[in-house]
């Protein structure tokens, strides 16, 4: 009588997360008589995923009908896989007895589950920082199989050198995560700028995920401050006017003081934003020169964005 | 330990009905295929009926002698076989054994103690 | 239906000698390579014991010295050596179709 073979064709199984995966497995004869059980992994600590006569495997059925006449076919079909299935699956023949005595294996199959990375998520600076300062961003994607990915950064379609990129765990593992930082120089033309992180793997069919971040939410384009008079009008009023232009972002507060004395203090609120992304604000002070007898001293005091205040002042003669 | 118990039996006239149970206990009962089969001094051994499993949907096989008359059935929630028996006649008398068909060939590997049904007036 | 005839009907073996059992059917139960014939021992008071399936094969826990042999419709089963505990019953039984049926049984004696 020849010896019993268990033959498992397949040294390895790929399949995508979330479908189904077929485990083949045939027997070279009905004798003797005792079940087929499914195992992943091998030695004392194996698990089963499927024995035909004994126990409920909801996810696991047989290809074949199990009962149908002469049936040597015990290969299994395991639904809605996840990488936590990943492993090596052995078709374990027994001879009937009591109990059940182990007699042949299978070469097994490896299954390696192909999972889609996470959308990539960018997040930057908790504070920001202005023009010519450094900054950091950081893209994080979870959950693919296979471990090799591709991840790229770039700044206005513009690929980005500076970063630095590590998968975890260096060792086997279900499933992996991916942990990139970029380093961008800032500049006040940054305003619209944006970064992409972008994620290729086999899983997405050459369509990578792409994850983005605005430098709008990581710069401080502080403004340019100008104090100028008008000429002189004939109710002995004069017309001086702080311009702060080119700063981001809008948050400001601007505070007028006349001779050290606070006149006036106004918010931003509304304005129309340049083509760069950044606002310009005019603000008058009418100075009654006729009221002071010696020279005014105009201070105009702007509060961007939570920073320290900037002056800019100015004195308007008062003629004897 | 796998164990078959039958129930049911006793002593019925000629076009009676009785109903028989089988409890099963020690393996997953609805995985196996389950038979009756009767023993009598004039017949001996004479297979009765065969009930499959919820995948071959439930597939009912009888001998010709009972067939339009017994009824196999089984409850998978109770690990449990049943033969409702109408129209009883003299020739059913014997015991009748609940059986586990192992490998889906009349493979008769356990059968239970018994239980006997007499039929006379 | 397939039947099958069993003989002798009775048999009385001395103790440590061969008792043969034979079973022949009405038509082949072979099918696809594979005997579809068993072979069972009963005791008074008790239910049938399976010794043998697809008609050669020890069922687990039964002694080596039970075995069964044929194909296609000659079947024989072998007891050596004979041992008290063997007075019984023997019968044979085939799935090779529907319905199942089986031998008129064979009583052995051990003298």
């Known amino acids: 009588e020849e010896e019993l073979q268990v033959i498992q064709p397949e040294k390895s199984v790929s399949v995508a997360a979330g479908d189904s995966a077929t485990l083949n497995c045939t027997v070279s004869s009905l004798i003797p008589v005792g079940p087929i059980q499914w195992f992943r992994g091998a030695g004392p600590g194996r698990e089963l995923i499927y024995n035909l006569k004994e126990g409920h495997f909801p996810r696991v059925t047989a290809v074949s009908d199990p009962t149908k006449r002469n049936n040597m076919d015990f290969s299994i079909r395991i639904s809605n896989i996840t990488p936590a299935d990943a492993g090596t699956y052995y078709c374990v023949k027994f001879r009937k007895g009591s109990p059940d005595v182990e007699l042949k294996s299978g070469a097994g199959t490896e299954l390696s589950v192909r999972a889609k990375p996470s959308a990539p998520v960018v997040s930057g600076p908790a504070v920001r920082a202005t023009a010519e300062h450094t900054v950091s961003f950081t893209c994080e994607s979870h959950g693919f199989s296979p471990r090799d990915i591709t991840l790229k950064w770039f700044k206005n379609g513009n690929e980005l050198s500076d970063v630095q990129t590590n998968v975890d765990p260096a060792g086997k593992s279900v499933s992996y995560s991916i942990r990139s930082t970029a380093r961008v120089l800032l500049t006040r033309r940054d305003v619209h700028s944006q970064v992409i992180c972008e994620v290729a793997h086999v899983t997405l069919q050459g369509d990578p995920l792409r994850g983005t971040a605005n430098l709008s939410e990581a710069i401080r384009v502080p403004p340019f401050l100008e104090v100028t008079q008008q000429s002189m009008r004939a109710d002995n009023q004069v017309n001086v006017t702080c311009q702060v232009t080119k700063f981001y972002p809008q948050r400001l507060q601007l505070t007028w003081l006349e001779n050290g004395n606070v006149s006036r203090t106004e918010m931003a609120s509304a304005l129309p934003e340049n083509k760069d992304g950044t606002y310009n604000w005019t603000s008058w002070l009418l100075v009654n020169v006729s009221a002071h007898r010696d020279d005014v001293k105009l201070t105009c005091q702007v509060e961007h964005d939570g920073q320290p205040a900037v002056n800019k002042s100015f004195s308007v003669k008062v003629s004897a | 330990e796998v164990k078959l118990e039958e129930s049911g039996g006793g002593l019925m006239q000629p076009g009676g009905s009785m109903k028989l149970s089988c409890v099963a206990s020690g393996f997953t009962f609805s995985n196996y295929w389950m038979n009756w089969v009767r023993q009598s001094p004039e017949k001996g051994l004479e297979w009765v009926a065969e009930i499959r499993l919820k995948s071959n949907n439930y597939a009912t096989h009888y001998a010709e002698s009972v067939k339009g008359r017994f009824t196999i059935s089984r409850d998978d929630s109770k690990s449990s076989v049943y033969l409702q028996m109408n129209n009883l006649r003299a020739e059913d008398t014997g015991i009748y054994y609940c059986i586990r068909d192992y490998d889906y060939d009349a493979y008769f590997d356990y059968w239970g103690q018994g239980t006997t049904l007499t039929v006379s007036s | 239906d397939i039947v099958l005839t069993q003989s002798p009907a009775s048999l009385a073996v001395s103790l440590g000698q061969r008792a043969t059992i034979s079973c022949r059917a009405s038509?082949?139960?072979?099918?696809?390579?594979?005997?579809?014939m068993y072979w069972y021992q009963q005791k008074p008071g008790q239910p049938p014991k399976l010794l043998i399936y697809?008609?050669?094969n020890l069922e687990s826990g039964v002694p080596a010295r039970f075995s069964g042999s044929g194909s296609g419709t000659d079947f024989t089963l072998n007891i050596h050596p004979v041992e008290e505990e063997d007075a019984a019953t023997y019968y044979c039984q085939h799935s090779g179709e529907l319905p199942y049926t089986f031998g008129g049984g064979t009583k052995l004696e051990i003298k």
């Open positions: 038509k082949s139960v072979s099918t696809s390579g594979y005997n579809y």
């Open positions: 697809l008609a050669s």
